[in-house]
């Protein structure tokens, strides 16, 4: 009886199992019982990344500089181009089709993880004993100054946004 299913890297057509085209090649004509599947390499700036029976290769992704994109990894006949964002920007999605400016962490917040071309800045509130008085995409929370270590006393308590203010110890005490 004619086959109803085929092995891996084959496909069923006209009651017959034909070889799929390897990655980097497209289908020109199906096999017959006398000749194998005819495949052709993808052209320049095209790719196919799986064993396939596609009659057209996919175009490589274009990393549009007008959208803040640049090429991270050039595509081959078997892989798509990988885009990333220019310095100071990150992708808006996993597909990285456009970029936005990295967010800054407001005063009272520090940078937990610096942004990359594909991920935004991650901020965290400054815990007790730490502060940040600037809006920054790089600065972590800084520890309050230890007045004690400087033989000074705390004139003003620190907050998440301000450092402590130290002053000379009151000699009358």
């Amino acid at each position: 009886e004619p086959p109803t299913a085929c092995r891996e890297k084959q496909y069923l057509i006209n009651s017959q199992c034909c070889s799929l085209c390897q990655p980097g090649q497209k289908l020109v004509s199906d096999c017959t019982e006398f000749t194998e599947t005819e495949c052709l390499p993808c052209g320049e700036s095209e790719f196919l990344d799986t064993w396939n029976r596609e009659t057209h290769c996919h175009q490589h992704k274009y990393c549009d500089p007008n959208l803040g994109l640049r090429v991270q990894q050039k595509g081959t006949s078997e892989t798509d181009t990988i885009c990333t964002c220019e310095e100071g920007w990150h992708c808006t999605s996993e597909a990285c089709e456009s970029c936005v400016l990295h967010r800054s962490c407001s005063p009272g917040f520090g940078v937990k993880q610096i942004a990359t071309g594909v991920s935004d800045t991650i901020c965290e509130p400054c815990p007790v004993g730490f502060f940040s008085n600037v809006s920054s995409a790089f600065e972590k929370c800084h520890p309050w100054t230890s007045c004690e270590d400087k033989n000074l006393e705390v004139l003003q308590k620190g907050t998440s946004q301000t450092n402590v203010i130290c002053g000379p110890q009151d000699r009358l005490r």
Epitope: N14, E33, F34, T35
Partner: antibody, heavy 117, light 107 residues
Framework: EVQLLESGGGLVQPGGSLRLSCAAS????????MSWVRQAPGKGLEWVSG????????YYADSVKGRFTISRDNSKNTLYLQMNSLRAEDTAVYYC??????????WGQGTLVTVSS | DIQMTQSPSSLSASVGDRVTITCRAS??????LNWYQQKPGKAPKLLIY???SLQSGVPSRFSGSGSGTDFTLTISSLQPEDFATYYC?????????FGQGTKLEIK
């Protein structure tokens, strides 16, 4: 034992017709693709035509397209080649062959077709 | 159609010799190549399929190699019964086509 026996060859005038037969035995005929291959006197092999199993597609060399017709009768275990508008260059020994995995593993003994006036 | 070119066209060798016949395709055919042996007045016989696989019942002194456009048939130690004509045949594109043949004669 697999056997293929061609018949129907002979002398024919240019423009004439001939029908070759190939009687198959010793295997499940309907399960195999079959083909005709010819060999002009003192020359090499030329693939002429093929027919898929289970009444599959038919395929021809450009040199015979439109003039030759391949067919099969699975109930009679027989392969045919109808040859019309014959030319001197069709003179050859015609072999029928069984196909398996893109190769011809069994061949008949051949039948001679001579096209001459 | 794909052209298959065999070399040499004829070859003289002695029993026990190692012999190599080459076959070149006019375009890439991957490993889609068969080799046949034909003796005078007889039908061809399949020796090698898919460029390098030995057909059942064929002696192991026959071997095939190659892919793309260049292929070889090697007989490691010629036996008297090996003197014949050898043909390559591609099945990468329709229609299947044969090389012109290599006649192996006794020296």
């Amino acid at each position: 034992e697999v056997q293929l026996l061609e018949s129907g060859g002979g002398l024919v005038q240019p423009g004439g017709s001939l029908r070759l037969s190939c009687a198959a035995s010793g295997f499940t005929f309907s399960s195999y693709a079959m083909s005709w291959v010819r060999q002009a006197p003192g020359k090499g092999l030329e693939w002429v035509s093929g027919i898929g199993s289970y009444g599959g597609g038919t395929y021809y060399a450009d040199s015979v397209k439109g003039r030759f017709t391949i067919s099969r009768d699975n109930s009679k275990n027989t392969l045919y080649l109808q040859m019309n508008s014959l030319r001197a260059e069709d003179t050859a020994v015609y072999y029928c062959a069984r196909y398996v995995n893109f190769g011809m593993d069994y061949w008949g003994q051949g039948t001679l077709v001579t096209v001459s006036s | 159609d794909i052209q298959m070119t065999q070399s040499p066209s004829s070859l003289s060798a002695s029993v026990g010799d190692r012999v190599t016949i080459t076959c070149r395709a006019s375009q890439s055919i991957s490993s889609y190549l068969n080799w046949y042996q034909q003796k005078p007045g007889k039908a061809p016989k399949l020796l090698i399929y898919a460029a390098s696989s030995l057909q059942s019942g064929v002696p192991s002194r026959f071997s095939g190699s190659g892919s793309g456009t260049d292929f070889t048939l090697t007989i490691s130690s010629l036996q008297p019964e090996d003197f014949a004509t050898y043909y390559c045949q591609q099945y990468g594109r329709n229609p299947p086509t044969f090389g012109q043949g290599t006649k192996l004669e006794i020296k």
